[in-house]
């Protein structure tokens, strides 16, 4: 045992500090992440600090600076891309973000070779996407929703589609509905391997119901902005595939992909294309009613100049527990011979994990099993498989590497990440260079998140991309709050918990409790991953306990546990809440007068029902732009999880987990209740409608709302916001400023 | 500073062969992806064919199968070979890292396929 004298700890002590609010509004302690831009085997870019594009190449160990800042400020680019043939760059300037991740921009060709930008024939501005060919230097984009093709950067467009209308008709881009609810991206066109044919989904939006909402501005009169948004139950877009030789487009012209019949016989969506070959293409389509998804794998006729897409290459996916897939349906990666692939899906266990499948979905030959889940399929090569999943120990919050050896019989598995920094690094992901030759390894946490680059045959670490050395160095006189993953068992349930405490915790003491949630289907909010936020700041300086509950609904446990929200959303989501704030206060270190809960969209929904539940639990609570009916809400993410609004389907759960139904119970908690009026994602309208309710029932309540700001709430807002919620809580909590 | 120098060129008839070699003076990385270039007078020049340090190639469009990039590591040469040759493949060729570096442009190889 070593005493230290008093005077030294003292000063130790002395020179610590807690954590402030601007700390956390500055960005002080954000952490960076090192995602090579791999253009080859053993090649790639990375964007310096100083902003030269600089080529790396790893296995002579040299860089150059292929695109100097000089040429880059020019334009005032602030992304690039390089083409395939590596004779051109583009450069985007006048970044306009659209919606979670559409946004319109100014391109500018620079070419290498020559070493000037290409004059003539210049791109169009506004444009809403732009991409290479995957081989070569052609360029596909999208300007005022219809497609044009270039052969190369000079030569004048080829306009493929006519038809494209805003608002209207959208080509080679999602609407709205199908940007956030089914393709996650803000583009909808799929070049083949080699650049042969171009694919693109056009939806038809004439006939969804419109979203209109106020933006005020600066002008006399606020602007109204007009979105075809599709609530539950309404119009859905109309959605068709077609695919174009880029070679002779004007030959035959674009050529629509048939949907298989048993999903055109009802509504239904497209949900992804994957090519396989230049003249072989998959996709994924699926009812309207989710839980039946078919896998399409489609071949080009020579000879019809034509897609043919045979039943006996339909692959059925169903559910009969739930929806179709975790929060979308998986992707399939195709294997060498072009026919076979790998997809992840429920075993009969009920556990997410990867299959193997070469003539029909029953003869899936499964390649993971367990009573944890795959999660992700990064690369697979003639002898390897790389995946994501959280079986190591035990603790679904966690993501490690692993390889399957497919070349040899019967397959070895190795986990790459398990054991590499194992207090430091539980949480991965990986970026893969061609052939697998190498890659790039991103740990987000526990501890300070770092980056490396390995041997893709060895997995032997060859350098550090991004340690963190400045934040490391930050942190050091900074009290932190400890934090713990620990797990709940109640009634066959496991219920996940993080829990975050003040730096000098001591059990014998009693915390104020501050819940965050947000609970939504196939989410998961308890992570082994670096954190510092608000909720740090609220245990570092102000001395509460912050805990995160993972309950049913949520991801990468199983289905029984995914599914058990299935048609009866703002359910067991809150009551699994309430079930672990008992158990924290049976753990005797929470002062039960003391206990507030707040989330942000569907967490803002969770947090308002569980003020709302009658239990007497929390003090006080905040929604942050919170879903109130689920008739509000988007029709492909609601129908998921509730299907329709119907008499005859499910009217009647939606009509009773509205927050309006309940508004009497918030008449003995403290409530906090923040919108954006620009919120396209989900409504005002949805707080509009909560506060009608509480005046109606003459409850009183607080409330904030955000001025043409959307559902993120950035810039000065979010100081605004954090500042405010600190002090409703401070308030709530009886803790003085 | 690496040197690079291209030799190999000439006259040829259409339809006729080259081969055009390009040496390094200092060291040059096997593991450096290289590639050819042309230029005609007047005209931007353009990409023929590019290596990887890997061995994976990529050929301009109006090559067809024609031509054929290779390396020799032993001699840190690389080389295109130039089958059935046509009046519009004369120009000067260079070559260079791929993606190209301004400061590394050599005199260049002139090809001129003419009858």
């Known amino acids: 045992i070593v005493l230290r004298p008093s005077r030294v700890h003292n000063s130790e002590e002395n020179t610590m500090r807690a954590l402030t609010l601007k700390d956390i509004l500055n960005g002080t302690f954000s952490y960076k992440t090192f995602f090579p831009n791999w253009i080859s085997g053993q090649e790639y870019l990375h964007q310096s600090a100083d902003n030269n594009i600089v080529l790396y190449n790893i296995e002579t160990g040299q860089s150059y600076t292929i695109l100097s800042n000089r040429t880059m400020k020019s334009v005032n680019a602030s992304n690039y891309g390089l083409s395939p043939d590596r004779q051109f760059v583009y450069l985007e300037s006048d970044y306009s973000k659209l919606w979670r991740y559409s946004y319109t921009a100014t391109y500018y060709i620079y070419d290498l070779s020559n070493g000037e930008f290409v004059r003539g024939n210049e791109l169009p501005r506004p444009i809403q996407y732009l991409c290479w060919s995957p081989v070569g230097s052609k360029l596909a984009y999208v300007y005022q929703n219809n497609i044009y093709l270039k052969q190369r950067p000079g030569d004048p467009p080829f306009q493929i589609t006519f038809n494209g209308r805003e608002n209207k008709i959208f080509n080679g881009i999602p609407d709205w509905v199908y940007e956030e609810e089914m393709l996650a991206t803000k583009y909808a066109l799929w070049w083949s391997p080699n650049g042969k044919f171009l694919a693109y989904a056009e939806f038809n939006d004439t006939d969804i119901p419109v979203i209109a909402y106020s933006y005020y501005g600066d002008e006399q009169y606020p602007r109204t902005i007009n979105i075809p948004y599709p609530k539950a139950g309404a119009k859905n877009p109309v959605v068709r595939i077609f695919i174009i030789d880029t070679t002779y487009p004007a030959y035959v012209g674009p050529q629509e992909v048939p949907v298989p019949a048993m999903i055109a016989s009802s509504d239904y969506y497209f949900s992804w294309l994957t090519w396989v070959t230049d003249e072989r293409v998959c996709l994924q389509w699926l009812k309207r009613v989710q839980n039946v998804s078919v896998l399409s794998i489609c071949d080009f006729r020579e000879d019809w100049q034509t897609w043919d897409c045979p039943k006996t290459q339909e692959h059925i996916e169903e559910s009969r527990t739930g929806w179709a897939g975790g929060f979308f349906v998986s992707t399939p990666v195709f294997s060498y011979d072009a026919i076979s692939y790998y997809k992840i899906f429920s075993d009969k266990d009920g556990y997410k994990h990867i299959h193997y499948i070469k003539d029909t979905v029953e003869n899936a030959i499964q390649i993971t099993s367990g009573k944890w889940e795959a999660i992700n399929i990064f690369r697979v090569t003639q002898d390897s498989l790389f995946y994501s999943s959280n079986e190591f120990e035990e603790y679904p919050g966690r993501r490690n590497i692993y390889r399957i050896s497919i070349g040899s019989y019967p397959p070895s598995k190795k986990c790459v990440t398990c054991h590499l920094r194992k207090e430091r690094c539980q949480y991965y992901t990986a970026s893969f260079s061609d052939y697998a030759k190498y890659y790039a390894l991103v740990c987000y946490g526990p501890g300070i998140p770092i980056s490396t680059l390995h041997d893709g045959r060895t997995d032997q670490e060859i350098k550090i991309l991004e340690e963190n050395k400045e934040l490391e160095n930050a942190l050091k006189n900074i009290q932190l709050p400890k934090e713990e993953i620990k797990k709940l068992e109640v009634d066959e349930i496991t219920l996940w918990y993080k829990m975050i405490l003040p730096p000098q915790f001591d059990r014998s003491k009693k915390y104020p409790l501050l819940i965050q949630v947000y609970g939504g289907p196939c989410s998961q909010s308890v992570r082994s991953v670096f954190a510092v936020n608000w909720i740090s700041y609220l245990a570092s300086k102000e001395g509460m306990v912050i805990a995160l509950v993972d309950g049913r609904g949520t991801a990468f446990q199983g289905d029984k546990l995914l599914y058990a929200v299935y048609r009866k959303l703002g359910v067991y989501e809150v009551e699994d809440q309430i079930t672990a704030v008992r158990k924290f206060i049976e753990m005797g270190f929470i002062d039960e007068k003391r206990i507030a809960i707040w989330g942000w969209s569907y967490g803002g929904y969770v947090s308002s029902l569980a003020l709302a539940s009658g239990t007497g639990l929390f003090k006080c609570g905040i929604a942050v732009a919170p879903v109130s009916s689920w008739e509000y809400y988007a029709s492909v993410y609601t129908e998921r999880f509730m299907g329709l609004p119907t008499k005859d389907d499910n009217l009647e759960h939606y009509k009773n987990s509205t927050v309006m139904a309940r508004a009497e119970y918030f008449r003995n908690v403290d409530y906090l209740l923040i919108h954006g009026t620009a919120d396209d994602n989900v409504h005002f309208q949805n707080s509009a409608q909560i506060a009608k309710a509480l005046v109606n029932a003459q409850v009183d309540f607080q409330a904030m709302w955000y001025s043409d700001q959307n559902h993120g709430l950035s810039g000065l807002s979010t100081n605004h916001l954090y500042t405010h919620m600190t002090h409703f809580l401070k308030q709530c909590f009886s803790l003085s400023d | 500073q690496v040197q690079l120098q291209e030799s190999g060129g000439g006259l040829v008839q259409p339809g006729g062969s080259l081969r055009l070699s390009c040496v390094a003076s200092?060291?040059?990385?096997?593991?450096?992806?290289m590639a050819w270039y042309r230029q005609v007078p007047g005209k931007r020049r353009e990409l023929v064919a590019g290596?990887?340090?890997?061995?994976?190639?990529n050929y301009a469009d109006f090559v067809g199968g024609r031509f054929t990039i290779s390396r020799d590591n032993a001699k840190n040469g690389l080389y295109l070979q130039l089958n059935g040759l046509k009046p519009e493949d004369t120009a000067a060729y260079y070559c260079?890292?791929?993606?190209?570096?301004?400061?590394?442009w050599g005199q260049g190889t002139q090809v001129t396929v003419s009858s």
């Open positions: 260079n890292f791929w993606p190209p570096l301004i400061n590394y």
């Open positions: 200092g060291r040059l990385s096997s593991s450096n992806s």
């Open positions: 290596i990887t340090g890997g061995g994976e190639t």
